[in-house]
């Protein structure tokens, strides 16, 4: 368990031409709030698909009223972090959607009106417990700057928050089989808390609250021997009473799965795949009806009104197995053409096409500029499977529809003066600076023979030395 934390640093006009109009006005003051939606894995799901990892809504920001004639500044933000708690393991790879919403506070009938200002999305890799990661995302002419991290809630630790830590019982070492809990070396890795009553000798768990039996034992708490021999568990821990550890058969030898179930080995024990009408660790439980809800992943249960008649699960797309328990990897058939990326969304298969290709399976080769109109005298320029508009003087944006003030975003660093020019903008740099936007000091330090700065260390703002 843990918490994903999102800190919004700024939301305002992005750099470059085409500064957006302020979302608020003197007549319609407004305030911002943000919504974050998290999904596991690197899937690029539709914005409206469920936020399986969780979602959060920020508080409302301060009320903002546009100053007439002033360019849209960075807008005032809500206080605090957006926090998305997650109950299970942190997946390591995740997709996010961050939405910026505007709440208008004018004289609307029926209270405030909400409208979506911008939506950014992305896919990232992130280890829990790491430092804040910074990001910049652009949505149209808006720019969102934010940081995020995932942290574990005690006693969970690790990059996936799956290891548990407890204070050491003895000062010098951890218990048998338990490692020190880096980076908390004064704590020890704790065993998972299994289902209450689960046999410590014959049961184990890979998830909190479960009880899985070692070979030779059964029952909900793994206290019932399958046979009278006390040495049926050659690969598990030795029996507490006999200390018996006889090298013996593998966990699937003799097929421990009853009622026609098929056995497969797992790292710790075995797993039975049961035929219809049976379930349990060894397929020993029968008489399942639809009332027991045996179909997983949204499968539809048919028949099985009484224990003597079998039920059938009709599985939704993307799942198979007698209980719809297995996910089908439909991407293994490589259905996407022309190097498209296959995304199995469960309910549908989607191809994310490379630039220059389109169609459900990326089968259509696009003429980049076909049907693309650039407004206000702009011309379409093809290249790399994408199109862009080369805009006439005074216009900008993807389709040259936005009136451009290239200096609105204050693009010149270190006190450089910005001038609008027919080719865009020109920065007139202060003495001692170079670069298209004056971002490079010619001599960044005043003293000679400065020692090398360690990585990431800032010797200081170059302006101080000139």
């Amino acid at each position: 368990a843990g918490v994903f934390e999102l800190q919004i640093h700024s939301f305002g006009p992005g750099p470059g031409p085409g500064a957006p109009r302020s979302p608020c006005s003197a007549r319609l003051p407004c305030r911002l709030f943000f919504r974050v939606c998290l999904k596991p894995g690197l899937s690029e799901e539709a914005a409206e698909s469920p936020c399986a990892l969780g979602a959060a809504l920020s508080a409302r920001g301060p009320v903002y009223t546009e100053q007439p004639g002033a360019p849209a500044p960075d807008l005032p933000l809500p206080d605090g972090l957006l926090q998305v708690p997650f109950r299970d393991a942190w997946p390591g790879t995740f997709s996010f959607i961050i939405e910026t919403w505007r709440e208008e506070l004018g004289d609307q009938i029926g209270g405030p009106a909400w409208s979506l200002l911008a939506r950014v999305a992305g896919r990232r890799r992130l280890a829990a417990g790491g430092p804040w990661a910074r990001d910049i995302q652009r949505a149209g002419a808006w720019e969102l700057r934010f940081s995020y991290r995932a942290r574990c809630e005690p006693p969970a630790v690790g990059t996936a928050c799956t290891r548990l830590c407890r204070p050491r019982s003895a000062p010098s070492r951890c218990g048998p089989g338990l490692r020190p809990c880096a980076p908390l070396e004064d704590e020890c890795e704790a065993p998972l808390v299994c289902r209450a009553g689960c046999s410590p000798e014959h049961g184990f768990c890979e998830q909190p609250g479960e009880c899985r039996c070692l070979e030779g034992w059964t029952g909900p708490l793994c206290t019932v021997p399958v046979s009278t021999s006390s040495c049926l568990s050659p690969r598990g821990p030795s029996s507490a009473t006999t200390g018996c550890l006889v090298p013996g058969p593998g966990p699937c030898d003799g097929n421990p799965c009853a009622n026609g179930g098929s056995c497969s080995e797992t790292p710790r024990s075995f797993e039975c795949t049961c035929p219809r009408g049976f379930y349990g660790l060894r397929c020993e439980v029968s008489g399942v009806t639809c009332a027991d809800g045996p179909c997983f992943n949204g499968g539809l249960c048919v028949g099985g009104a009484d224990p003597d008649s079998a039920y059938i699960c009709h599985c939704p797309p993307g799942f198979q197995g007698s209980n719809c328990e297995k996910r089908v990897d439909r991407c293994s058939l490589q259905p996407c053409r022309n190097g498209g990326l296959c995304l199995d969304l469960g309910h549908a298969l989607r191809c994310r096409c490379r630039a220059g290709f389109a169609g459900p399976r990326c089968e259509h080769d696009l003429d980049d500029c076909a049907g693309r109109a650039c407004a206000n005298g702009g011309t379409c320029v093809e290249g790399g499977g994408a199109h862009r508009c080369s805009c006439a003087l005074g216009f900008g944006g993807r389709d040259c529809r936005e009136r451009a003030d290239p200096c609105a975003a204050r693009p010149c660093a270190h006190g450089g003066r910005c001038y609008a020019h027919f080719s865009g903008l020109v920065c007139a740099c202060a003495p001692g600076y170079m670069g298209a936007r004056c971002e490079f000091p010619v001599h960044p330090d005043g003293a000679s023979a400065l020692p090398a700065a360690p990585p990431g260390l800032r010797p200081g703002d170059p302006q101080r030395y000139l």
């Epitope: 990232r124 910049i136 971002e439 490079f440 000091p441 960044p444 990431g456």
Partner: nanobody, 117 residues
């Protein structure tokens, strides 16, 4: 925080070539302006070449036509291709990043380039 790690320095003969690489830890490297600086013993650190976030480049006169700066945003890296090296190019070469989010400069630790026969 932007971490910068340079590599590729070493000993080369006059007239030889060398390529320096700088890897940035920043997740949005396309929004960094990056540059190479150098500092010879007993001298001030000076700009060699820079590449803005829009891809435009700048060079000091002493390296124009010999050095080329380039970037690969997909690899979070910036490169300095140095040809026709001279003894006076001997210095510690530093990677520099100007992060537009907070208008902050960041520096790498440096890599030594020695031009000598």
């Amino acid at each position: 925080e932007v971490q910068l790690v340079e590599s590729g320095g070493g000993l080369v003969q006059p007239g030889g070539s060398l390529t320096l690489s700088c890897a940035a830890s920043f997740s949005a490297v396309a929004y960094l302006s990056m540059a190479w600086y150098r500092q010879a013993p007993g001298k001030k650190r000076e700009l060699v070449a820079g590449i803005s976030d829009d891809g435009s480049t700048v060079y000091v006169d002493s390296v124009k036509g010999r050095f080329t700066i380039s970037r690969d945003n997909a690899k979070n890296s910036v490169y300095l291709q140095m040809n026709s090296l001279r003894a006076e190019d001997t210095a510690v070469y530093y990677c520099y990043a100007y992060e537009w989010t907070n208008a902050l400069p960041y520096w790498g630790q440096g890599t030594l380039v020695t031009v000598s026969s």
